[in-house]
């Protein structure tokens, strides 16, 4: 499937609108600090060049690879050295090393100001004045803050963003119409970014075998009526799509994703009865819908797994003939029978099964050795079941905010070296598992909870990799992808940690606290809580609760005072002194 001009091929396949959007996303994810106007200029230049190649594929430079074309374009940025420092050294390299170099410099936590949402009227005016620029700005701002965002999915978000403004800017009450939609897009966008980041980490840190195993398990749960060979084909195609997107090959990724959606819709009968409603939708919506589709019903007549994987005299023969295929079939068969298990648990079971076969197929009596392999799965299954049960009980007892605080304390004690902003962000997100999953029926709780926790813990891992401070975090993040969550769960209080010296400045608050939103107030209080635990890692729950209750009372009192700043100045030191005494 070779083309004289790759850029012309992709331009024709994707169409001008998607081509321009994807190039803007690619450039924004690589050069995260560049101003919007600079990126728009580069995108326009690339687009004009692509059009010349469409007109004549033999024109000069049209035969160059996309990496070469895009890399050359990025390297024309005048301020590269001043803005990005050593990233400018990438431009001295040849492809493919240059692209690898750009990828390595993607920043998961770029030093960019938080996006502030202007007044609704201001946004609607901007939307009506120049819709194209308004939507490009959205792509740019999201892409530069989320350098691994799944690019074709970001085009779908942009389409929804456009639809929200088109509808709500004509509504009688613009704000009531628009703001909930923007909140939903923001929250879904953050979740989508984090999920994609785990896929890219899985591919980049653990290889495509790890990603394929994840995909076999997940797709087998979604499509339990599909044959193993069908699932394998989907897994191969999906792996290609995500490898491309994670590698910055966004045009190829979007094109291949569209092909995969087309294939799935043309072969619904062999995949799932749930695809029908997705397949009538336009491309971006269709691909999103297929990715999120609910699990099909399990076939009613699935036989016991034991016959093929425990009782058969040919287990070791079948395993030896094609190890990965045999394990893939085991994973497929187990996953399609267990939509109630998390993907990570299914992968742990496959890993345990593999370890047993490796040991037993070399033993004197292999069958005797592996006869009880399914019994060994029981503790692996019970561990996440118990964890979900205990944490949902705690969530129901405490509510979200206090549940987050319990996790903040728990994780700060485990890994106190991690920066306070990271501990606050990660623990707040871990705490959201309660509202997200605990209301679900029993059969959906574990897959919801554990697979969500894997996404959140991956965020901790990528932030920690940038500035490593804890050997424990490094160990849990790098040793095994499927055992990350159990690894973190098993961590205890870090006895080797030297408590942080007390700094009164950390616990000094001002009247601006009173004008903060409820969420911002929570973050302030939770930041203080982490600092308290870092100062007194052995403080009991009761001691910490007492201090936090006093803190809330102190803030509430001063925010009601006539002279708020004076109150904070007077009551603050008293609160600090009382807290130190309580924790002594």
């Amino acid at each position: 499937d070779t083309h004289k001009s790759e850029v012309a091929h992709r331009f024709k396949d994707l169409g001008e609108e998607h081509f321009k959007g994807l190039v803007l996303v690619a450039f924004s994810q690589y050069l995260q600090q560049c101003p919007f106007e600079e990126h728009v200029k580069l995108v326009n230049e690339v687009t004009e060049f692509a059009k010349t190649c469409v007109a004549d594929e033999s024109a000069e430079n049209c035969d160059k690879s996309l990496h070469t074309l895009f890399g050359d374009k990025l390297c024309t940025v005048a301020t590269l050295r001043e803005t990005y420092g050593e990233m400018a050294d990438c431009c001295a390299k040849q492809e493919p090393e240059r692209n690898e170099c750009f990828l390595q410099h993607k920043d998961d936590n770029p030093n960019l100001p938080p996006l502030v949402r202007p007044e609704v009227d201001v946004m609607c005016t901007a939307f009506h004045d120049n819709e194209a620029t308004f939507l490009k700005k959205y792509l740019y701002e999201v892409a530069r803050r989320h350098p691994y965002f799944y690019a074709p999915e970001l085009l779908f978000f942009a389409a929804r963003y456009k639809a929200a403004f088109a509808e709500c800017c004509q509504a009688a009450d613009k704000a009531a119409c628009l703001l909930p939609k923007l909140d939903e897009l923001r929250d879904e966008g953050k979740a989508s970014s984090a999920k994609q980041r785990l896929k890219c980490a899985s591919l980049q840190k653990f290889g495509d075998r790890a990603f394929k195993a994840w995909a076999v398990a997940r797709l087998s749960q979604k499509f339990p009526k599909a044959e193993f060979a069908e699932v394998s084909k989907l897994v191969t195609d999906l792996t290609k799509v995500h490898t491309e997107c994670c590698h910055g090959d966004l045009l190829e990724c979007a094109d291949d994703r569209a092909d995969l959606a087309k294939y799935m819709c043309e072969n619904q009968d062999s995949i799932s009865s749930k695809l029908k409603e997705c397949c009538d939708k336009p491309l971006l919506e269709k691909s999103h819908c297929l990715a999120e589709v609910e699990n099909d019903e399990m076939p009613a007549d699935l036989p016991s797994l034991a016959a093929d994987y425990v009782e058969s005299k040919d287990v070791c023969k079948n395993y030896a003939e094609a190890k990965d295929v045999f394990l893939g079939m085991f994973l497929y068969e187990y996953a399609r029978r267990h939509p109630d298990y998390s993907v990570m648990l299914l992968l742990r079971l496959a890993k345990a099964y593999e370890a047993t076969l490796e040991k037993c197929c070399a033993a004197a009596d292999p069958h005797e050795c592996y006869a009880k392999v399914f019994d060994e799965f029981q503790p692996l299954v019970e561990e996440p079941q118990n964890l979900v049960k205990q944490n949902c009980e705690l969530f129901e007892q405490l509510g979200e905010y206090k549940f987050q605080n319990a996790l903040l304390v728990r994780y700060t004690k485990k890994v106190p070296q991690v920066s306070t902003p990271t501990l606050v962000e990660v623990s707040r997100n871990l705490g959201k598992v309660g509202a997200k999953c605990c209301k679900l029926p029993e059969a959906k709780r574990m897959p919801c909870a554990e697979d969500y926790l894997s996404v959140v813990l991956n965020r901790l891992c990528v932030l920690h990799e940038k500035t490593p401070v804890s050997e424990k975090v490094t160990k849990c993040c790098t040793e095994s992808l499927v055992n990350r969550r159990p690894c973190f769960s098993a961590l205890e209080l870090d006895e080797a940690y030297v408590p942080k010296a007390f700094n009164a400045e950390t616990f000094t608050f001002h009247a601006d606290m009173c004008t903060l939103s409820e969420k911002e107030k929570q973050v302030k209080k939770q930041t203080a809580l982490v600092e308290l635990v870092k100062h007194k890692p052995k403080a009991t729950k009761e001691q910490l609760k007492g201090v936090m209750d006093n803190f809330a009372a102190f803030v509430e009192k001063c925010c009601k005072a006539d002279d708020k700043e004076a109150c904070f100045a007077e009551e603050g030191p008293k609160f600090v002194a009382a807290s130190q005494a309580a924790l002594a």
């Epitope: 044959e227 069908e230 062999s270 995949i271 076939p299 009613a300 036989p303 093929d308 058969s312 295929v325």
Partner: nanobody, 124 residues
Amino acid sequence: EVQLLESGGGLVQPGGSLRLSCAASGFTFSLYRMVWVRQAPGKGLEWVSMISQFGNQTYYADSVKGRFTISRDNSKNTLYLQMNSLRAEDTAVYYCAKVRSWDQTGGRRTFDYWGQGTLVTVSS
């Protein structure tokens, strides 16, 4: 390319036996469930038997249960159908096919590649 080649058909008396073989090539045989399907003269297609990838699960149409046995040898990429106690109504062209999708209870069965068939005639 995918190829399925049936053999072993012929003329046999009622009550007699035959063993059909199907040699597969052009795909990873062990990844697929396989079936035998038949077409009697002037009739539609009827599925006869299905076997799982490792051969431990087998399904039979009620009309052949207890008389026919399906098996496979993945090392030889070959599918078999042992037919005993043959009856006149078993006369048909027998095809082996690669399963595309299979829902036993829902009756949804699709096959994407077929052989050219082998004729079995049961007559005295």
